[in-house]
């Protein structure tokens, strides 16, 4: 898989929060490509050397996944072709909080965006009338 490295594509993320013990979503979108096989998604976390998640050639590639995320991540594979690189994080842990990078490579070029992910015990406020 080769790209010049000189072209950049637009990648957009949204800061979000996850409830400990529940599933969370790290949102990321990008300029879509025509061919799914030309899209690479890499999720990284600040200070962690292994990957959070990698998706390439139309499927997950988890050989370089960091141990702390093993078995807990997934992308929405059927939505990658339309530019959705969001990550589903299962069983959110307190230690999942931090800065993440969504890194995208397509035939058009590459791009990335960071997002802050907060974790905690959040609850919906009750409204009494």
């Amino acid at each position: 898989f080769g790209i010049s490295g000189r072209h950049s594509i637009t990648v957009t993320t949204v800061a979000s929060a996850g409830n400990i013990g529940e599933d969370g979503i790290l949102s990321c979108t990008f300029e879509p490509d025509i061919k799914l096989s030309d899209i690479v998604i890499q999720w990284l976390k600040e200070g962690v050397l292994g990957l959070v998640h990698e998706f390439k050639e139309g499927k997950d590639e988890l050989s370089e996944q960091d141990e702390m995320f093993r078995g807990r991540t997934a992308v929405f594979a059927d939505q990658v072709i339309v530019g959705n690189a969001s990550l589903r994080l299962k069983n959110v842990q307190l230690t999942d909080a931090g800065t993440y990078k969504c890194y995208i490579i397509t035939s058009k070029g590459k791009g990335n965006a960071n997002l802050e992910y907060k974790t905690g015990a959040f609850s919906m406020p009750e409204v009494n009338v």
């Epitope: 690479v40 990284l44 600040e46 200070g47 962690v48 292994g50 702390m68 230690t95």
Partner: antibody, heavy 121, light 107 residues
Framework: EVQLLESGGGLVQPGGSLRLSCAAS????????MHWVRQAPGKGLEWVSA????????YYADSVKGRFTISRDISKNTLYLQMNSLRAEDTAVYYC??????????????WGQGTTVTVSS | DIQMTQSPSSLSASVGDRVTITCRAS??????LAWYQQKPGKAPKLLIY???TLQSGVPSRFSGSGSGTDFTLTISSLQPEDFATYYC?????????FGGGTKVEIK
């Protein structure tokens, strides 16, 4: 000024132990992954070990796995390498190095001056 | 483990020459590649990261290119202070691995 200063090297017999330290200053220590890299006399660079910014994840070269332990004390801004069951082939200059940026995909931008470990009887 | 093969292992060049060093990874590392310069008795110095990004303070005569498995470090006009050993290093996969080094000597 961003600085790394190693200490703890010396002469040790085969089978012995040493603990290397790397004192960091001038940057936020707990946001950077840190590495140990070594260089045997007249040889090239060999990556030894690394630790995540939080200290929660550690990584080792196969040649040192089970013998070396990397750790960090964020309160002291110090990185450590505990080396046990030392062998002659562990003889090298040991460098600590900081990961550039906050993620794993870049190189090592700040290096210490190195500390020499000699394993010999 | 990913193997990094650097070539040549040594070269002789003159001041003002254009010098090219290549590095090949045993499998794709995208652009997760750095280049270092090391002088005798000194710690390595980061020159290039992300395959082609020049580290702050490094002269613009140094440039990097490539992605996937094949990478190049180019010194456009060799200066006296550039005589040193150069290493490539991949950071896509642990264990991180270095190339064997290229010693640039004075012709």
């Amino acid at each position: 000024e961003v600085q790394l200063l190693e200490s703890g090297g010396g002469l040790v017999q085969p089978g012995g132990s040493l603990r290397l330290s790397c004192a960091a200053s001038g940057f936020t220590f707990n946001t950077h992954a840190m590495h140990w890299v070594r260089q045997a006399p007249g040889k090239g660079l060999e990556w030894v070990s690394a630790i995540s910014g939080s200290g929660g994840s550690t990584y080792y070269a196969d040649s040192v796995k089970g013998r070396f332990t990397i750790s960090r004390d964020i309160s002291k801004n110090t990185l450590y390498l505990q080396m046990n069951s030392l062998r002659a082939e562990d003889t090298a200059v040991y460098y600590c190095a900081r990961l550039l940026g906050r993620f794993g995909e870049y190189g090592m931008d700040v290096w210490g001056q190195g500390t020499t470990v000699t394993v010999s009887s | 483990d990913i193997q990094m093969t650097q070539s040549p292992s040594s070269l002789s060049a003159s001041v003002g020459d254009r010098v090219t060093i290549t590095c090949r990874a045993s499998r794709s590392i995208y652009t997760w590649l750095a280049w270092y310069q090391q002088k005798p008795g000194k710690a390595p110095k980061l020159l290039i990261y992300d395959a082609s990004t020049l580290q702050s303070g490094v002269p613009s005569r140094f440039s990097g290119s490539g992605s996937g498995t094949d990478f190049t470090l180019t010194i456009s006009s060799l200066q006296p202070e550039d005589f040193a050993t150069y290493y490539c290093q991949q950071s896509y996969s642990t264990p991180y691995t270095f190339g064997g080094g290229t010693k640039v000597e004075i012709k």
